[in-house]
């Protein structure tokens, strides 16, 4: 267990031209506040995916009124740190989103209004217990300067806050194999005792007495390889006879989600869908109102009409969920017709149409043959969103403009020689073969495998292919 701490140093116009307008004015005074969202790993997760490591909201900053004509200065900031407690191990690598919000304090009906000024995101490596790391991030014309660190809560220590420290039993030294707990030299590292029998290779523990499995292993002691090929259930200890998985304890068993949250399993853990008014990894954060800025992704917060609708987020296009935390996969509805490629640009959908189709949803089938002539007597044939020409004999190519070489495909069998002819091709057959393509052998007794040769042609004469 531990705490991620974020200190905002400044928020103001970035360097370079195009300084942003002040977000506040004499007519509309405002104040800033910040929201941080943390996720484990270096994932390229979208802004709306759950803040699995936790989230925090700052206090409101001092009220600020723009001085007319003055450029936007660094804006006054809220006091104090943003603190995100984490219950489990610190992952070492994490992704963050820091949002700067403006609270307008004008005389609006319905109370103050919130709007998102800037959002910065990044992926970092950070060991718990280390010094403050400084960072500068830009969002449009704005610049945010901040520092962050992760620190363990006693008795946890170490870069992941998984080692435990205990006061020394002997004044001079620690027990066998146990080191002093830097920086608490008067304490000793406590052995982390996992559940008895927990596999040292495939299991680990973050709390004494537990046994958590690495991916690919299961069972109470993490000794059973996961093999679901012939099984129905996706988890649990192996059946001794089949090697199949049978249902065992899953991450949602016992429902870790508090306050009526519903649990769904994810490949590595679980995810809580929280009722309105609660959020956090386990729906443990409660008493949320619009003052807490619960609507993500620029959602507009309004107070609800009863205790179960304490606040309501009106989501911008492309987002949904009670906190606007889910991106709508609008392409999953397959809005592009006729094989068009769907692109969700966030603010809008675009369809990239296949040849021969047009329109916002590729719904218009272009008249493929309109204005397209096929040369040399060819006829245009529509089909599949593309035109093609059915060419007259002796011509080929997309528009029948190329004179076809009928001999290019070597149509004469058994060594026959091909001659181009104005109406097609002629095969001169090798001795012992006959037919339009020299495909029939002449029988040894002089009789043909065909009916008698047409009058005027002896076997072996060139046969013209019509």
């Amino acid at each position: 267990a531990g705490v991620f701490e974020l200190q905002i140093h400044s928020f103001g116009p970035g360097p370079g031209p195009g300084a942003p307008r002040s977000p506040c004015s004499a007519r509309l005074p405002c104040r800033l506040f910040f929201r941080v969202c943390l996720k484990p790993g270096l994932s390229e997760e979208a802004a709306e995916s759950p803040c699995a490591l936790g989230a925090a909201l700052s206090a409101r900053g001092p009220v600020y009124t723009e001085q007319p004509g003055a450029p936007a200065p660094d804006l006054p900031l809220p006091d104090g740190l943003l603190q995100v407690p984490f219950r489990d191990a610190w992952p070492g690598t994490f992704s963050f989103i820091i949002e700067t919000w403006r609270e307008e304090l004008g005389d609006q009906i319905g109370g103050p209004a919130w709007s998102l000024l800037a959002r910065v995101a990044g992926r970092r490596r950070l060991a718990a217990g280390g010094p403050w790391a400084r960072d500068i991030q830009r969002a449009g014309a704005w610049e945010l300067r901040f520092s962050y660190r992760a620190r363990c809560e006693p008795p946890a220590v170490g870069t992941a806050c998984t080692r435990l420290c205990r006061p020394r039993s002997a004044p001079s030294r620690c027990g066998p194999g146990l080191r002093p707990c830097a920086p608490l030299e008067d304490e000793c590292e406590a052995p982390l005792v996992c559940r008895a029998g927990c596999s040292p290779e495939h299991g680990f523990c973050e709390q004494p007495g537990e046994c958590r499995c690495l991916e690919g292993w299961t069972g109470p002691l993490c000794t059973v390889p996961v093999s679901t090929s012939s099984c129905l259930s996706p988890r649990g200890p192996s059946s001794a006879t089949t090697g199949c998985l049978v249902p065992g304890p899953g991450p949602c068993d016992g429902n870790p989600c508090a306050n009526g949250g519903s649990c769904s399993e994810t490949p590595r853990s679980f995810e809580c869908t929280c009722p309105r008014g609660f959020y956090g990894l386990r729906c443990e954060v409660s008493g949320v109102t619009c003052a807490d800025g619960p609507c993500f992704n620029g959602g507009l917060c309004v107070g609800g009409a009863d205790p179960d609708s304490a606040y309501i987020c009106h989501c911008p296009p492309g987002f949904q969920g009670s906190n606007c935390e889910k991106r709508v996969d609008r392409c999953s509805l397959q809005p592009c017709r006729n094989g068009g490629l769907c692109l969700d640009l966030g603010h809008a959908l675009r369809c990239r149409c296949r040849a021969g189709f047009a329109g916002p949803r590729c719904e218009h089938d272009l008249d493929d043959c309109a204005g397209r002539a096929c040369a040399n007597g060819g006829t245009c044939v529509e089909g599949g969103g593309a035109h093609r020409c059915s060419c007259a004999l002796g011509f080929g190519g997309r528009d029948c403009r190329e004179r076809a070489d009928p001999c290019a495909a070597r149509p004469c069998a058994h060594g026959g020689r091909c001659y181009a002819h104005f109406s097609g091709l002629v095969c001169a057959c090798a001795p012992g073969y006959m037919g339009a393509r020299c495909e029939f052998p002449v029988h040894p007794d002089g009789a043909s495998a065909l009916p008698a040769a047409p009058p005027g042609l002896r076997p072996g004469d060139p046969q013209r292919y019509l």
Epitope: I109, G110, G111, G260, G261, S262, C274, P275, R276, T289, V302, G303, G304, A305, D306, P307, D308, S309, A310, I312, S322
Partner: antibody
């Protein structure tokens, strides 16, 4: 547009029973708490009962005047709200409304319950 | 059990501004009471006007606004119209129990 349609009202004798239904459409019924409100002839509004959603374990709440006589329930799969009324009294005569609160109040058109000897 | 009190009747003229209030016997009304305002017109025609103290329902004219004034919830009609003549109920939530006021009969002469 959100629609709440109440049915099941009628004339019943004192100590009798009646079950009201409310069919809900055009919103995600499962997400929200639902309520019954009534208005006796010539009187004001009185809240009767409330049922929360599945996330809140379908917790129920009642006005003191109907406690132990009325039971509110819901069927999320059918988007239906119910009010089972037992041991009815003459003072239960009223127009009964299915009501849900979100950003503001949504009302049905009501169903009339008359308790008379 | 909380008691919610409203003015029994108010009279205003077209174009005037009128404020209806809603008092709680348990103390000051706060946003945690999620004050709601409902309009009743003849033939049991109920319309939700305001929810959650401030939120005006879609289709409700902008002349209707909800707020907290002192220790009471308030419904203000800025520039009353003759069609605003109706009975107005306020409802306050106390945890999971809802209590309505007795209603204010508004006359627009």
């Amino acid at each position: 547009e959100v629609q709440l349609v109440e049915t099941g009202g009628g004339l019943v004798q004192p100590k009798g029973s009646l079950k009201l239904s409310c069919a809900v459409s055009a919103f995600t019924f499962t997400t929200y708490a639902m309520n019954w409100v009534r208005q006796a002839p010539g009187k004001g509004l009185e809240w009767v009962a409330r049922i929360r959603n599945k996330s809140n374990n379908y917790a129920t709440y009642y006005a003191d005047s109907v406690k132990d006589r009325f039971t509110i329930s819901r069927d999320d799969s059918q988007s239906m709200l119910y009010l089972q009324m037992n041991n009815l009294k003459i003072e239960d005569t009223a127009m009964y409304y299915c009501v849900f609160y979100y950003d503001y109040v949504y009302w049905g058109q009501g169903t009339l319950v008359t308790v008379s000897a | 059990q909380a008691v919610v009190t409203q003015e029994s009747a108010l009279t205003t003229s077209p174009g005037e501004t009128v404020t209806l209030t809603c008092r709680s016997s348990t103390g000051a009304v706060t946003t945690s009471n999620y004050a709601n305002w409902i309009q009743e017109k003849p033939d049991h025609l109920f319309t939700g006007l305001i929810g959650g103290t401030h939120n005006r329902a879609p289709g409700v004219p902008a002349r209707f606004s909800g707020s907290l004034i002192g220790d009471k919830a308030a419904l203000t009609i800025t520039g009353a119209q003759t069609e605003d003549e109706a009975i107005y109920f306020c409802g306050l939530w106390y945890s999971n129990h809802l209590v309505f006021g007795g209603g204010t009969k508004l006359t627009v002469l």
